[in-house]
Amino acid sequence: LPGVGLTPSAAQTARQHPKMHLAHSTLKPAAHLIGDPSKQNSLLWRANTDRAFLQDGFSLSNNSLLVPTSGIYFVYSQVVFSGKAYSPKATSSPLYLAHEVQLFSSQYPFHVPLLSSQKMVYPGLQEPWLHSMYHGAAFQLTQGDQLSTHTDGIPHLVLSPSTVFFGAFAL
Amino acid sequence: LPGVGLTPSAAQTARQHPKMHLAHSTLKPAAHLIGDPSKQNSLLWRANTDRAFLQDGFSLSNNSLLVPTSGIYFVYSQVVFSGKAYSPKATSSPLYLAHEVQLFSSQYPFHVPLLSSQKMVYPGLQEPWLHSMYHGAAFQLTQGDQLSTHTDGIPHLVLSPSTVFFGAFAL
Amino acid sequence: LPGVGLTPSAAQTARQHPKMHLAHSTLKPAAHLIGDPSKQNSLLWRANTDRAFLQDGFSLSNNSLLVPTSGIYFVYSQVVFSGKAYSPKATSSPLYLAHEVQLFSSQYPFHVPLLSSQKMVYPGLQEPWLHSMYHGAAFQLTQGDQLSTHTDGIPHLVLSPSTVFFGAFAL
């Protein structure tokens, strides 16, 4: 499992399916993004690879998901962090890891935290270490709202399609 | 809470409800499986007990969920692990705990990891210990796709209906 | 991120949107509650503030969500706990942290655990500490069912709209 995700060749094979009609339903806005594994010190979301997709109006701009239609959406994200033994040098103070989904809306001119998870890791005490964070919830969103993420501990991310992702779907 | 889940007699009483129509909607494929608590060294999914169910085409075969209709599904799973120290204050190797939801599809002949969570636990350091992992996301699936799980640390699973589960529903 | 959530004045501005029609859909029951940050030693759910809402029949009574219509619902909750060490590197008893979503139904006269997450924290070893728990799953519920939560470690909750929440929506 640590080597999660697909090899480059497998990733080519496993491109997202062509747009499909939802089981027993008309299409509804949905998106699933994965963290770009080629960018090691940033978290850039990608929609055109592996299992990722944008459907029925969702778009990705400036690393944010743009909400296509007003309504209630389930929004979710996961990150996995890892580290090596004794990677800290002259400290035993904990490493602060956090992941947040934020909303930027025309209604108020600042980023509102929607989902936040946090962890302190003591790398000198626990070597090597791995930690996963997941969260998701339903929110009333307005057309044009921007959903983005903020992460503390980006250099420690385990970037693969199954470990670091961000998505939303209309209910 | 450690004694989560129902007693055997209560489980009899609490069998899943008869199939019900979804609030304000036609039925859509949905499934919720629980880990069989009678199997201590394996993770066998069950649909015919407690709060578990299979609805509108989902089926369980070879410990995998079979996708009934092409479309976008939200897929989720949780595990809870627990353990005791090997020996008080003893130095021990870390225990690698991981849980993954995998896709096996006719489109490519290998298991693709969809959702992965991982953790290192240092039992000698922290005794007793408990750890929960949850993940879920939206995926484009094709009729006949097989959803399964792979778990590292199965002997440490806390098998009850509310702690170890696996499910999916069409959006 | 620890200072997540809105300031009181911003919270006024950011009250939930007026009831909106779901993208491409008729309304369906949905609810998202947040932990009341003014109550430090209890977990009281609120629906009339920040991003929280009750829609299409959901109501909040005696700190429980009342299910408005029989059907399948996705139910979810998150908590974040934090604390400081009793004394640096001191050996201390573990702190048991747990969060559970429970169902009380007319069908059987006791609380059934639906979702449970648990953690042992060793404050003397790890100071300060932070831990997040999330879970969610699909359940067949009946009109009048009551969904509530039980938490061990309430004094350690990080009460903000983005860290402690509880919700459900009809599929």
């Epitope: 035993s92 490493l95 890891l97 956090a98 626990q126 503390d152 501990g153 | 350091l125 | 620890p2």
Partner: antibody, heavy 114, light 113 residues
Framework: EVQLVESGGGLVQPGGSLRLSCAAS????????IEWVRQAPGKGLEWVGE????????NYNEEFKGRATFSADNSKNTAYLQMNSLRAEDTAVYYC???????WGQGTLVTVSS | DIQMTQSPSSLSASVGDRVTITCKSS????????????LAWYQQKPGKAPKLLIY???TRDSGVPSRFSGSGSGTDFTLTISSLQPEDFATYYC?????????FGQGTKVEIK
């Protein structure tokens, strides 16, 4: 290239206050604690305390509690040390450091004198 | 607080000499679970910031010459310079990061004989 750059030092009157800045660049700032260490002229090193910029958590040397306050602005990748009720014996070079990676700034001299 | 005591407080040596500096802590810095000693060694030259040499008692920082080595466990630690070079004349400090407050030794000044 990783750099920690302190600023804000100078001459201060006894009883006065000052705010030192520590600007970090070349690495992600928020997850790693910034430590403050001072060194009086011709003396050894003394740990003042530390702050986790992302979480806002702090640890103070009891000798400085009440007179020292740590803060951080993640958007500016900068940590701050506010020192109040300064005395002559607070005259020192003040360093910020990231113990996780082993980086230290060049230091800034604070002189408390009338 | 953990007290850190270095000896000697100063020493005179020649280029090529083997130099040993000791550091004693008032309580053990060994964390038994992972057998790690929470001790670092720094080098400081006049007018400059301290430079990390050794961490976890015996791990050399990147770029630090191999003539520097750290040893010891529990309460007794040693910094050794196997063959003193002209650029090594400086003051050396040990520091514990086992508990708060972090504390330093009083320093050992290595001077040219």
């Amino acid at each position: 290239e990783v750099q920690l750059v302190e600023s804000g030092g100078g001459l201060v009157q006894p009883g006065g206050s000052l705010r030192l800045s520590c600007a970090a660049s070349g690495y992600t700032f928020s997850s790693y604690w910034i430590e403050w260490v001072r060194q009086a002229p011709g003396k050894g090193l003394e740990w003042v305390g530390e702050i986790s910029p992302g979480s806002g958590s702090t640890n103070y040397n009891e000798e400085f509690k009440g007179r020292a306050t740590f803060s951080a602005d993640n958007s500016k990748n900068t940590a701050y040390l506010q020192m109040n009720s300064l005395r002559a014996e607070d005259t020192a070079v003040y360093y910020c450091a990231d113990g996780y990676h082993g980086y230290w700034g060049q230091g800034t001299l604070v002189t408390v004198s009338s | 607080d953990i007290q850190m005591t270095q000896s000697p407080s100063s020493l005179s040596a020649s280029v090529g000499d083997r130099v040993t500096i000791t550091c004693k802590s008032s309580q053990s810095l060994l964390y038994s679970t992972n057998q790690a000693n929470f001790l670092a060694w720094y080098q400081q030259k006049p007018g400059k910031a301290p430079k990390l040499l050794i961490y976890w008692a015996s791990t050399r920082d990147s770029g630090v010459p191999s003539r520097f080595s750290g040893s010891g466990s529990g309460t007794d630690f040693t910094l050794t310079i196997s063959s003193l070079q002209p650029e090594d004349f400086a003051t050396y400090y040990c520091q514990q990061y086992y508990s708060y407050p972090r504390t330093f030794g009083q320093g050992t000044k290595v001077e040219i004989k």
